[in-house]
């Protein structure tokens, strides 16, 4: 089984410039327990929550989110309404975090290109960032040193070979689209920025968070590329300055125990198996 991936696609309808839709999907074998969509940065790192979606409880959303919904069992969409005369969404980063079992939490971000001209020239490659939760870094300087060394090695190696192509995607030709992909390995995309960090936050799949049926079955389309609502093959317009962060660790507070799937759940638990999470959200 390959490393899970999260894709993010931001669309602005050509007919309605104040209407945006964020599409996100999870490609992996795990069971999705929660999806958080934020803007202005990753959730918990300067970003502001726009919506939280649970596969059975439903969805919570906050302005300017208009409608959050599941498109498939492993992808969601969030419609946004821009009431302002100017369009603040155009320069905004949107992030989607998928909490899955047993992989942990994976997040990816993307944004619209600054120009609204559909005929943009070839864009730069998104920058992959391995993001670390601060609490997980403490006391793990050794891991960080190793990571920095590895990243430097990658940087050096990338200079001596061409930038690989992004994975092909399907986008709506009627929309301006930005897509950010979380590659299976960091080396699959060019590392242009020196400030990447290594994620050290991990929530192990302990016995009390184990899936009742063992490993979850593969999502029906996990092996395929994501497909937009009205998809037609075209070259995606990638956001300038968009980035991807791959985070393999469920987001728990330091010192918080992984809750059990039975009674006595910890409030607002972020690190838990699907049964414990499968039962609370409703689309609002």
């Amino acid at each position: 089984a390959g490393t899970p991936e999260v894709w993010v696609q931001v669309q602005m309808e050509a007919t309605e410039l104040s209407s945006f839709t964020v599409h996100c999907g999870f490609l992996g074998p795990g069971s999705i327990s929660l999806v958080t969509v934020s803007w202005g940065g990753p959730d918990g790192a300067g970003g502001t929550k726009l919506a939280v979606l649970h596969p059975e409880l439903g969805t919570r959303q906050w302005a300017p989110a208009r409608q959050a919904r599941w498109e498939t069992q492993s992808s969601i969409s969030l419609a946004l309404e821009d009431s302002g005369a100017s369009s603040p969404f155009a320069n905004t980063t949107f992030c989607c975090k998928f909490a899955s079992f047993p992989e942990g939490s994976w997040e990816s971000c993307g944004s619209l290109p600054p120009s609204s001209d559909p005929g943009l020239s070839a864009p730069p490659t998104p920058v992959p960032i391995l993001r670390a939760d601060l609490a997980g870094i403490l006391g793990l300087s050794g891991v960080l040193l190793f990571g920095c060394g590895y990243l430097l090695h990658l940087l050096r190696r990338q200079k001596h070979r061409p930038t690989p192509r992004l994975q092909p995607s399907h986008t709506n030709s009627q929309a301006l689209t930005a897509q950010a992909w979380a590659p299976s390995q960091a080396s699959q995309a060019a590392l242009h920025d020196p400030y990447a960090t290594i994620n050290t936050s991990f929530c192990p799949a302990t016995l009390d968070t184990a899936h009742p049926n063992g490993w979850a079955s593969l999502p029906t389309h996990a092996a395929h590329q994501p497909q937009g609502p009205a998809a037609s093959a075209s070259t995606p317009i990638l956001a300038r300055g968009s980035f991807v962060s791959v985070e393999n660790g469920l987001y728990t507070q330091a010192g918080e125990r992984p809750p059990h799937t039975g009674p006595g759940l910890t409030l607002f638990p972020d690190c838990r198996g699907p049964r414990a999470l499968e039962g609370r959200f409703g689309v609002r």
């Epitope: 939280v52 906050w62 409030l267 689309v283």
Partner: antibody
Framework: EVQLVQSGAEVKKPGSSVKVSCKAS????????IEWVRQAPGQGLEWIGE????????NYNEKFKGRVTFTADESTSTAYMELSSLRSEDTAVYYC???????WGQGTLVTVSS | DIVMTQSPDSLAVSLGERATINCKSS????????????LAWYQQKPGQPPKLLIY???TRESGVPDRFSGSGSGTDFTLTISSLQAEDVAVYYC?????????FGQGTKLEIK
């Protein structure tokens, strides 16, 4: 174990305001919405609205818009609901709840009487 | 707003017998994307807050006895208590968890015959 503890019962005059508090413990306060639901004597449950403590983003039931205000204090993990221009039909038990109505406070009885 | 209508308003069942409560929504609570129904059931005993029993129309909350089960799809849902116990005497509510605002049924009072 998550707990939501609400402030005590209140008796108010028509036209006045009431502010009910809801203190959360046992989890990450800013992760999920705090919901407010009320129940008039012998009646059903009515959603008033919600607040997301981290960003103070809110959603209100149209019926209560303009009369209700939600606030949250992350430093004390406490959410507040203030209802103004009280009338007799606002007499009810007011509940705070979280995580998609999985956790509930014990309720606060607000009596509006002249 | 989605209107939730429960039937019957009250129900008297003998101990050990089956109790069935119905809930009808004015709009479908089925999300076509992931084929999930966003409906929840709550139990409320006198002087207590409601307690979540069932979510996703049929998934039992942790710690809820298996005599409680939920079924249905779209607009028609059912809560079944397979063998009524004395402690099950309460008011039961269904709730639209599909779209804003969350709305509740008027409640069904369950008593022992």
């Amino acid at each position: 174990e998550v707990q939501l503890v609400q402030s005590g019962a209140e008796v108010k005059k028509p036209g006045s305001s009431v502010k009910v508090s809801c203190k959360a413990s046992g989890g990450t306060f800013s992760s999920f919405s705090i919901e407010w639901v009320r129940q008039a004597p012998g009646q059903g449950l009515e959603w008033i609205g919600e607040i997301l403590p981290g960003s103070n983003s809110t959603n209100y039931n149209e019926k209560f818009k303009g009369r209700v205000t939600f606030t949250a204090d992350e430093s004390t993990s406490t959410a507040y609901m203030e209802l103004s221009s009280l009338r007799s039909e606002d007499t009810a038990v007011y509940y705070c709840s979280s995580y998609w109505f999985a956790y509930w406070g014990q309720g606060t009885l607000v009596t509006v009487s002249s | 707003d989605i209107v939730m209508t429960q039937s019957p308003d009250s129900l008297a069942v003998s101990l050990g017998e089956r109790a069935t409560i119905n809930c009808k929504s004015s709009q479908s609570l089925l999300n076509s994307g992931n084929q999930k129904n966003y409906l929840a059931w709550y139990q409320q005993k006198p002087g207590q807050p409601p307690k979540l029993l069932i979510y996703g129309a049929s998934t039992r909350e942790s710690g809820v006895p298996d005599r409680f089960s939920g079924s249905g799809s779209g607009t028609d849902f059912t809560l079944t208590i397979s063998s009524l116990q004395a402690e099950d005497v309460a008011v039961y509510y269904c709730q639209n968890a599909h779209s804003y605002p969350p709305t509740f049924g008027q409640g069904t009072k369950l008593e022992i015959k």
